[in-house]
Interface confidence: low
């Protein structure tokens, strides 16, 4: 039950996160004009990854796409690439995770296959979230750098002519949407990976039967020494008796004095 809840919650959180990444990528407000010392005060400019917009006090708004790819900063291209990779990975992760959901039965899909798919989608969500966070952070870093550069240049001349005004840009809403969305996708991915650990094929729950053998009183439980699937905490494979036999989890190699000979 807890596994299903963790998986379901991870899926929902990732879904919200990826929707946020898509929204942030499409938004125009990645950078907004800092209105300090702007002479043509009626103009407010904001920019996205794909186009630049001008809004005026009269209500007139015009957006224009960036005309040339070559004319744009390499870092802007990198941010675009990171966001697109994040969206693509996230979308594939969502598709995989739908089929991996424990509450959805598709044919005779085994739990081990669902566990693998859950892990795959979880990793995809983590990478997707990291791509989005990286993209937004790179853009924010560019903005900070440009902000202080333009502040320094505000009263410096070019060709002997004093440039009295330099428009500066600050963080737009899309940056915050991107950071939050990337974080949610990352958290969702981690939750999927955690859920995967509990998705080992479940055994049939038989009642433990006691057999009274001469000299020993030992309780045997079917499947008690079944090999671990490798998907995590082996709660089912508990030691039943103290006869020296150990489950696979219990004979893990812990450091001993013999390890260092």
């Amino acid at each position: 039950m807890a596994v299903t809840a963790c998986q379901g919650l991870g899926f929902v959180v990732s879904l919200i996160g990826i929707a946020g990444i898509i929204a942030a990528t499409c938004m125009d407000q990645w950078s907004t004009q800092d209105l300090y010392n702007n002479p043509v005060t009626a103009v407010f400019n904001y920019q996205g990854l794909w186009r630049s917009c001008v809004r005026e006090s009269s209500g007139f708004t015009e957006c224009r796409g960036y005309f040339t790819l070559l004319g744009l900063p390499a870092m802007l291209q990198a941010v675009r690439a990171l966001m697109i990779v994040g969206i693509v990975l996230g979308a594939i992760g969502l598709l995989v995770s739908i089929f991996a959901l424990k509450c959805i039965r598709i044919g005779s899909m085994e739990d081990s296959a669902k566990a693998n798919m859950t892990l795959t989608s979880g990793i995809m969500f983590i990478v997707s979230g990291l791509c989005a966070i990286a993209g937004v952070s790179v853009f924010a870093n560019m903005l900070v750098t440009n902000f202080w550069m333009s502040t320094a240049n505000m009263y410096t001349g070019m060709g002997g002519m004093v440039q009295t005004v330099q428009t500066r840009y600050t963080f737009g809403a899309a940056l915050f949407v991107g950071w939050v969305a990337g974080g949610l996708t990352l958290i969702g991915g981690v939750m999927m990976c955690i859920a995967c650990r509990g998705l080992a094929p479940e055994e049939t729950n038989y009642k433990a039967v006691s057999y009274h053998a001469s000299g020993h009183s030992v309780a045997y439980k079917p499947g008690g020494f079944k090999a671990s699937t490798g998907f995590g905490s082996n709660t089912k494979n508990k030691k039943i008796y103290d006869g020296g036999a150990r489950t696979e989890d219990e004979v893990q190699s812990y450091p001993s004095k013999h390890d260092y000979v």
């Epitope: 043509v40 009626a42 009269s58 015009e62 744009l72 900063p73 440009n146 330099q166 428009t167 500066r168």
Partner: nanobody, 119 residues
Amino acid sequence: QVQLVESGGGLVQPGGSLRLSCAASGEISSDAMAWYRQAPGKQRELVAGMTRGGSTNYADSVKGRFTISRDNSKNTLYLQMNSLRAEDTAVYYCNAEIYTGTFYPRSYWGQGTLVTVSS
């Protein structure tokens, strides 16, 4: 690349009128265009600015006397100067700003046209 070419400057008597023109060529149409002036030994100052949408802004010293206008189809900016005074003597520069993906507008300047108000 945007080229700005100013014209219409010259010598005029106080109280007279002049019309400056600024023709922009190349690349794409500007988002904001403005007239600046620089008198000898002084800093350059904004005279009047106009946006693509038609919003205008004037320096206090020229309000009511100067009128900025723009023909988007010809990509030309105009400055109608009436009731000229001696203190309006300066080199008048045309400025165009284009908002792009480079985080602050690319600013282009013309070579300037001299306006002399003298009797």
